[in-house]
């Protein structure tokens, strides 16, 4: 089953992601962006569990290899950043667990490729425009809301999940 | 269930100044922004401003800096609203709105409004 | 400051009608693949709700009846087929720049 603390601590790594702002988000209005959040891919109808926990995976995965790069460690508090990190590797190694657990119990593909391959292309899109703006605080600040919103659609999907046990 | 609960009606003298609060529960008072909003009667709506009260970080409307002061008590998850030097045209209802959907800035749920009526 | 200027200020439309309203803004509140307008709807004695935001989503727990559209300075809310329930004023509100502003707001009656 994919445990509660897994949603708790996702909770909590939204809660440190919100006191990590060092900005005012008002003064950085003129530099939102649509990074194209692949919301279907959150959508837990439409797959099987152990697919499910593979997207939930790659997006934290993908989550923590952005926070964990140099430009991230100059843009954040660093005690912070440090709870933010142990915090998503801790649901990392969560998901795993649960995969290994779901594996023998589905006869499905362990990957949703498609899915696998949305989440990529959208933190793509997100480095690409950091580098754009030149890892600006703005850019930053931009960028710490689009993962609160994207770590809240992985929190539903979750709870999606959760359902169906 | 997310719940914002404000004060009572007021009523006040021209020159005085007022303070009203919005009780939250329900969710997490300090991660969301809490937007302030006038409606005078019969008339639309007008944003104040917005506060942090996990910082305590505050942005006015221009038109509102002198007049509205936004501060937000997070052990007592509550937001307060001061308005000074009132006047007639402060008469109106005074919403407090959670912020939602994060840097989209749109407004989710809302208080029921506390009615300040100036008056001599 | 952005000025919406909402069109008509009240319509009357009959039971299972299209009610169309209109927001123009002063200004585009359009910018990278985002339109920042959002949609109220206010009945007598309540408080405003969330119906749509980013000119075309539909917010959680709204009927599907209600649809926004529009980019840059020009954005429809459409009410097809409209319900008795659906009689009340309804608001734009941009955040696309500071300070953030509402329409004058459009008062729907039902025939």
């Known amino acids: 089953d994919l445990p509660q603390t897994h949603s708790l601590g996702n909770r909590r790594a939204l809660i440190l992601l919100a006191q990590m702002g060092r900005i005012s988000p008002f003064s950085c209005l003129k530099d939102r962006r649509d990074f194209g959040l692949p919301q279907e891919e959150f959508d837990g109808n439409q797959f099987q569990k152990t697919q499910a926990i593979s997207v939930l995976h790659e997006m934290i995965q993908q989550t923590f290899n952005l926070f964990s790069t140099e430009d991230s460690s100059a843009a954040w508090e660093q005690s912070l950043l440090e709870k933010f990190s142990t915090e998503l590797y801790q649901q990392l190694n969560n998901l795993e667990a649960c995969v290994i657990q779901e594996v023998g119990m589905e006869e499905t593909p362990l990957m949703n490729e498609d899915s696998i391959l949305a989440v990529r292309k959208y933190f793509q899109r997100i480095t690409l425009y950091l580098t754009e703006k030149k890892y600006s605080p703005c850019a930053w600040e931009v960028v710490r809301a689009e993962i609160m919103r994207s770590l809240s659609f992985s929190t539903n999907l979750q709870k999606r999940l959760r359902r169906k046990d | 269930q997310v719940q914002l609960q404000e004060s009572g009606t007021v009523l006040a003298r021209p020159g005085a100044s007022v303070k009203m609060s919005c009780k939250a529960s329900g969710y997490s008072f300090t991660t969301y922004w809490m937007h302030w909003v006038k409606q005078r009667p019969g008339q639309g709506l007008e944003w104040i401003g917005v506060?942090?009260?996990?910082?305590?970080?505050?942005t006015y409307n221009q038109k509102f800096k002198d007049k509205a002061k936004l501060t937000a008590v997070t052990s007592a998850n509550t937001a307060y609203m001061e308005l000074s030097s009132l006047t007639n045209e402060d008469s109106a209802v005074y919403f407090c709105t959670r912020n939602y959907k994060y840097d989209y800035y749109t407004m989710d749920y809302w208080g029921q409004g506390t009615t300040v009526t100036v008056s001599s | 400051d952005i000025v919406l200027t909402q069109s008509p200020a009240s319509l009357a439309v009959s039971l299972g009608q299209r009610a169309t309203i209109s927001c123009r803004a002063s200004k585009s509140v359009s910018t990278s693949g985002h339109s920042y307008m959002h949609w109220y709807q206010q009945k007598p004695g309540q408080t405003p709700k969330l119906l749509i935001y980013?000119?075309?989503n539909l917010e959680s727990g709204v009927p599907a009846r209600f649809s926004g559209s529009g980019s840059g300075t020009d954005f429809t809310l459409n009410i097809h087929p409209v319900e008795e329930e659906d009689a009340a004023t309804y608001y734009c509100q941009h955040s696309g720049e500071l300070p953030f502003t509402f329409g004058s707001g459009t008062k729907l009656e039902i025939k």
């Open positions: 506060i942090y009260p996990g910082n305590g970080d505050t």
């Open positions: 980013l000119a075309s």
